[in-house]
């Protein structure tokens, strides 16, 4: 069964800047990745970025830079200032859509310690 992993890290240089990394562990080819915060996209979450392997990347503030790391993983850097900036307990979710298999999603937040955290 495919799985999604989510890693949230606070940047040491900018304490309110976050990096979210997500990956898809499965055999299908990825058609779309949606990154949201405040919960899953279908349950009150707000979309931060949408990444399509052919048609490019769309992102919305406070997302600063979304990119593909591999064919099945992405990263997203969030701005660390402004009213819409994330806080330490913000939940980030990634949804990977693969055709014709379907979609898989997982959420994660900053771990209690300052070490990078991994949650699936």
């Amino acid at each position: 069964t495919p799985e999604v992993w989510v890693q949230v890290r606070m940047e040491a240089t900018e304490l309110s800047s976050f990096t979210i990394r997500c990956g898809f562990l499965g055999s299908g080819s990825i058609s779309l990745v949606t990154v949201s915060w405040g919960g899953p996209n279908g349950a009150g979450g707000t979309t931060l970025a949408v990444l399509h392997p052919e048609r490019g990347i769309r992102q919305w503030a406070p997302a600063r830079q979304a990119r593909w790391e591999t064919q099945s993983s992405i990263s997203l850097i969030l701005e660390g200032s402004g009213a819409s900036s994330p806080c330490a307990n913000t939940t980030f979710c990634c949804k990977f859509a693969s055709f014709p298999e379907g979609s898989w999603e997982a959420c994660g937040s900053l771990p209690p310690s300052s070490d990078p955290g991994l949650s699936a």
Epitope: S31, G42, A43, A97, F99, P100, S103
Partner: antibody, heavy 120, light 107 residues
Framework: EVQLVESGGGLVKPGGSLRLSCAAS????????MSWVRQAPGKGLELVSA????????YYLDTVKGRFTISRDIAKNSLYLQMNSLRAEDTAVYYC?????????????WGQGTLVTVSS | DIQMTQSPSSLSASVGDRVTITCKAS??????VAWYQQKPGKAPKLLIY???NRFTGVPSRFSGSGSGTDFTLTISSLQPEDFATYFC?????????FGQGTKLEIK
């Protein structure tokens, strides 16, 4: 303007074969996932087969596995459904449809349909 | 497979009425729900995608809502051209599955 035009339907005896075609125009055919959906007389909609834009990943309804084959010809902008060993229960209007990644794989454009009747 | 159970199966209403059609998934389908309209002898047409987004050219009287397993299609003020059959569909997990349809008839 996006257009999908099916052809190839008709009356066939049980055990016979038909090849349905769907001519696509008005969009970059190679970039979209495509499906065949059928509707038996007076009944609901049923996904029969689907093919990823990479032409590798496919889906088949359990009852048609081993009998139907989905394929496409990018040069001809055409989608096909080869139907062998046809049964009475395959009688339906067959539609080809395009899936939009940005719409959660919703089928945003459909052809007008072609009627397949399997009867002795 | 994920089952999509639509209700009611048929509905009689008058022009100007507010109508609600519901669809219940057998398990969570996130926000991967679409609604289609089909008229007799015609192909289905996409109305709503991602639960609540209207497709190009769809009038604002059509709206969708819900999350998880429970979804609704609402027509705020029925027009004569709205009498048709409506289908919900999930595209969260293969195979994509449809509701059995709701036939909207003139009262």
């Amino acid at each position: 303007e996006v257009q999908l035009v099916e052809s190839g339907g008709g009356l066939v005896k049980p055990g016979g074969s038909l090849r349905l075609s769907c001519a696509a125009s008005g969009f970059t055919f190679s970039s979209y996932h495509m499906s065949w959906v059928r509707q038996a007389p007076g009944k609901g909609l049923e996904l029969v087969s689907a093919i990823n834009s990479n032409d590798i990943n496919t889906y088949y309804l359990d009852t048609v596995k081993g009998r139907f084959t989905i394929s496409r010809d990018i040069a001809k902008n055409s989608l096909y459904l080869q139907m062998n060993s046809l049964r009475a229960e395959d009688t339906a209007v067959y539609y080809c449809a395009r899936h939009e990644d940005y719409y959660g794989f919703a089928m945003d454009y459909w052809g007008q349909g072609t009627l397949v009747t399997v009867s002795s | 497979d994920i089952q999509m159970t639509q209700s009611p199966s048929s509905l009689s209403a008058s022009v100007g009425d507010r109508v609600t059609i519901t669809c219940k998934a057998s398990q969570s389908v996130s926000n991967d729900v679409a609604w289609y309209q089909q008229k007799p002898g015609k192909a289905p047409k996409l109305l709503i995608y991602y639960v609540s987004n209207r497709f190009t050219g769809v009038p604002s009287r059509f709206s969708g809502s819900g999350s998880g397993t429970d979804f609704t299609l609402t027509i705020s003020s029925l027009q004569p051209e709205d009498f048709a059959t409506y289908f919900c569909q999930q595209a969260y997990r293969s195979p994509w599955t449809f509701g059995q349809g709701t036939k909207l008839e003139i009262k």
